[in-house]
């Protein structure tokens, strides 16, 4: 399955929208920095495409879930959020189309399941942090910065997969 070129463009648009969503000066939020433990090893180049597609799908699904909450809607600009949802939804569709075409529908490797679990735990840590920080503006900015970084890293994986073919 070849992810369409539009998927790559969509990823870039997603990052641009995340950048535009900023609401406050970040300089006041230094002390709110936090180690969320992004499972970078789960996005390493050692995976086959059949293994990476479901992990990337999980990553984008979790981002969608995170920014679809009531607390998120209160934190961000509604128009930008709607555009953001649209981009993520399109990327999920692209990845799901690959799964339907037969990529990764054979016997599920244990490694892939572990990777999906690691991504879920990562987002649980982010959700817990927001809760502990009472969904403060700075906490949301720290999370937005973290999602930009982790999404960018996972996007780079998609690009490396495409260039290997």
């Amino acid at each position: 399955c070849d992810l369409p070129q539009t998927h790559s463009l969509g990823s870039r648009r997603t990052l641009m929208l995340l950048a535009q969503m900023r609401r406050i000066s970040l300089f006041s939020c230094l002390k709110d920095r936090h180690d969320f433990g992004f499972p970078q090893e789960e996005f390493g180049n050692q995976f086959q495409k059949a293994e990476t597609i479901p992990v990337l799908h999980e990553m984008i699904q979790q981002i969608f879930n995170l920014f679809s909450t009531k607390d998120s809607s209160a934190a961000w600009d509604e128009t930008l959020l709607d555009k953001f949802y649209t981009e993520l939804y399109q990327q999920l569709n692209d990845l799901e189309a690959c799964v339907i075409q037969g990529v990764g529908v054979t016997e599920t490797p244990l490694m892939k399941e572990d990777s999906i679990l690691a991504v879920r735990k990562y987002f649980q840590r982010i959700t817990l942090y927001l809760k502990e920080k009472k969904y403060s503006p700075c906490a949301w900015e720290v999370v937005r910065a973290e999602i930009m970084r982790s999404f960018s890293l996972s996007t780079n994986l998609q690009e490396s997969l495409r260039s290997k073919e």
Epitope: L26, L30, K31
Partner: antibody
Amino acid sequence: EVQLVQSGAEVKKPGESLKISCKGSGYSFTSYWIGWVRQMPGKGLEWMGIIDPSDSDTAYSPSFQGQVTISADKSISTAYLQWSSLKASDTAMYYCARHPGLNWAPDFDYWGQGTLVTVSS
Amino acid sequence: DIQMTQSPSSLSASVGDRVTITCRASQSIDEFLNWYQQKPGKAPKLLIYFASSLQSGVPSRFSGSGSGTDFTLTISSLQPEDFATYYCQQAHSFPLTFGQGTKVEIK
């Protein structure tokens, strides 16, 4: 390879203006902030200020607020430090360094080689 | 502003010695503390970030500890290339501030 390359040494007279530069390469320039640090001859490090090149938001140390201006041109991955009217006390080595912003990553992990500014009549 | 106080301001030691430099913040900075090494005519080099994380490429003889207001940089066995000036820096809030430096000289 990540690099921050600063402009060359400058010799200026009191009252003159100056703009020194710091060009980033080998990484996404807008994903990191750029900070400026002063070191006067034989003295320690003093943080001057910082810029987020993605939107040019700046923060200054109270000691340097109004004395210098920090700017950036993201199209050429370059940050700047400028003076409108130099004083003899501005004689120092000036360093730029990159900062990961709100990400949990090493602060000021890469530094420029420094720009020596000498102000003398 | 958060004031950073380093001690000692200078020390003399021999190759192989265990060296400890302390840094105290005027208020709690959690673990937002960095350590840098600077040699004459060179830019500072990051050694330790977030109080205890060793920067990539830095020898394991360097270690950092502490949280809140009191921090320590330890060189377990001083090497000839370690003779330099060391600075702590708080990364908790702006304005960022450095300690005054500790010069490690050859005894």
